[in-house]
């Protein structure tokens, strides 16, 4: 909501999760792994990489089925705490200028830092209009105090807010699982909010920094390396 059409393939780590229709976004973090939101879990997912217009085959797409879909063991569907999911692709993505991985964070998100949020979610704060072309939004990371004041009792240490307290610009339904990137690092995953782009209701995002170890451990545990002794 309140964003702009991204320059074509300018967000090369952005993926669309498809189950017959686009239902969530995600981020490519290595040639065979995608991170998304826990509440985007489905039993079968096709990962679509290199997308810009999701309704048109433009020639740069890679469609790869999920081989493994791993939701965080402490995901809470009621509070959306630990709202993170890992997807192992059935075959590695071909990395090129239009499809490439985003780095995991080396430090937690800092208030005031500019970030890029992207996705194919609803572009209206009232009603619905789902775009075909990838939308981008530049937005600042808010302080934890502002975040907690916006959603009293709902914000855990695994969440942070990004956006504008005045409303008008935000992620929305269909953006879940997608990236929040600051300084070339994946700081957030689109998670939840009360409505979209409402005053004093900024978007809430999963704090990826808290899950770097879980991500690395999960990837290691689900990668088949054959050691010959």
């Amino acid at each position: 909501v309140g964003g702009y059409i991204c320059e074509e393939n300018s967000v090369p780590y952005q993926v669309s999760l498809n189950s017959g229709y686009h239902f969530c976004g995600g981020s490519l973090i290595s040639e065979q792994w995608v991170v998304s939101a826990g509440h985007c879990y489905k039993s079968r997912i096709q990962v679509r990489l290199g997308e810009h217009n999701i309704e048109v085959l433009e020639g740069n797409e890679q469609f790869i089925n999920a081989a493994k879909i791993i939701r965080h063991p402490k995901y809470n569907s009621r509070t959306l705490d630990n709202d993170i999911l890992l997807i192992k692709l059935s075959s590695p993505a071909v990395i090129n200028s239009r499809v490439s991985a985003i780095s995991l964070p080396t430090a937690p998100p800092a208030a005031g830092t500019e970030s890029l949020i992207s996705g194919w979610g609803n572009t209206l704060s009232s009603g619905a209009d789902y775009p075909d072309e990838l939308q981008c939004l530049d937005a600042p990371v808010l302080s934890q105090a502002e975040c907690e004041a916006s959603y009293p009792g709902k914000i855990t240490n695994n969440m942070f807010c990004v956006g504008f307290l005045e409303g008008g610009k935000d992620s929305c339904q269909g953006d879940a699982g997608g990236p929040v990137v600051s300084n070339g690092e994946l700081q957030g995953i689109v998670s939840w909010g009360y409505g979209c782009a409402q005053k004093n209701r900024p978007g809430v995002y999963t704090k990826v920094y808290n899950y770097v170890d879980w991500i690395k451990d999960t990837i290691a545990a689900n990668s088949h390396h054959h050691h010959h002794h």
Partner: antibody, heavy 126, light 106 residues
Framework: QVQLQESGPGLVKPSETLSLTCTVS????????WSWIRQPAGKGLEWIGR???????NYNPSLKSRVTMSVDTSKNQFSLKLSSVTAADTAVYYC????????????????????WGQGTTVTVSS | DIQMTQSPSSLSASVGDRVTITCQAS??????LNWYQQKPGKAPKLLIY???NLETGVPSRFSGSGSGTDFTFTISSLQPEDIATYYC????????FGGGTKVEIK
């Protein structure tokens, strides 16, 4: 409140195309997903597909090669075409509205079909 | 396709009885499960969405539970107006319905 009304020929010849229209009254067709479902006499329900008001579609894989859905927002209508019909396509055809995004999570979620038409019987016979 | 196996296919119970219907998915569908009631000659009516949430205006004697592959639909105290066929429906991938359970009064 929103009401749906299916319309179209009650009799279609084998190998021809079945065409049905659903008219939405009491509310706007815009900003919603809409589905078609069918039910052969005395049998269960089969989902045919859904369409969003932008024209984006999602079809049952078993029927995909024969199904076309379209939407006309100016008339508050959406339509179904099913080609190469046989006697097995004889059924009551329903249109329905898909319920989406109740919660605060930002995925696209469907929560069932909350408004249905009364259904129209289509018989495939020569 | 995800198969939905509903049981029993029919049942007969007395007014005031507790009625339970089960639905099993062929694979994990999380909570992408809805329940409908269909009376003869009528369109289906949504009762429960997201496995356990009661649709607006539906009597509280109807309830649903479950997650993953196994789901349950319950009528806590069967009423004469509950005579109908009940269907489960998944929306994890595309949409499929269970075969239905016909509920009759003894």
């Amino acid at each position: 409140q929103v009401q749906l009304q299916e319309s179209g020929p009650g009799l279609v010849k084998p190998s021809e195309t079945l065409s049905l229209t659903c008219t939405v009254s009491g509310g706007s067709i815009s900003s919603y997903y809409w589905s078609w479902i069918r039910q052969p006499a005395g049998k269960g329900l089969e989902w045919i597909g859904r369409i969003y008001t932008s024209g984006s579609t999602n079809y049952n894989p078993s029927l995909k090669s024969r199904v076309t859905m379209s939407v006309d927002t100016s008339k508050n209508q959406f339509s179904l075409k099913l080609s190469s019909v046989t006697a097995a396509d004889t059924a009551v055809y329903y249109c329905a509205r898909d319920l989406t995004n109740y919660g605060s999570g930002k995925s696209i979620r469907f929560y069932g079909m909350d408004v249905w038409g009364q259904g129209t019987t289509v018989t495939v016979s020569s | 396709d995800i198969q939905m196996t509903q049981s029993p296919s029919s049942l007969s119970a007395s007014v005031g009885d507790r009625v339970t219907i089960t639905c099993q998915a062929s694979q994990d569908i999380s909570n992408y499960l809805n329940w409908y009631q269909q009376k003869p000659g009528k369109a289906p009516k949504l009762l429960i969405y997201d496995a356990s949430n009661l649709e607006t205006g539906v009597p509280s004697r109807f309830s649903g539970s479950g997650s993953g592959t196994d789901f349950t639909f319950t009528i806590s105290s069967l009423q004469p107006e509950d005579i109908a066929t009940y269907y489960c429906q998944q929306d994890d991938n595309f949409i499929t319905f269970g075969g239905g359970t016909k509920v009759e009064i003894k």
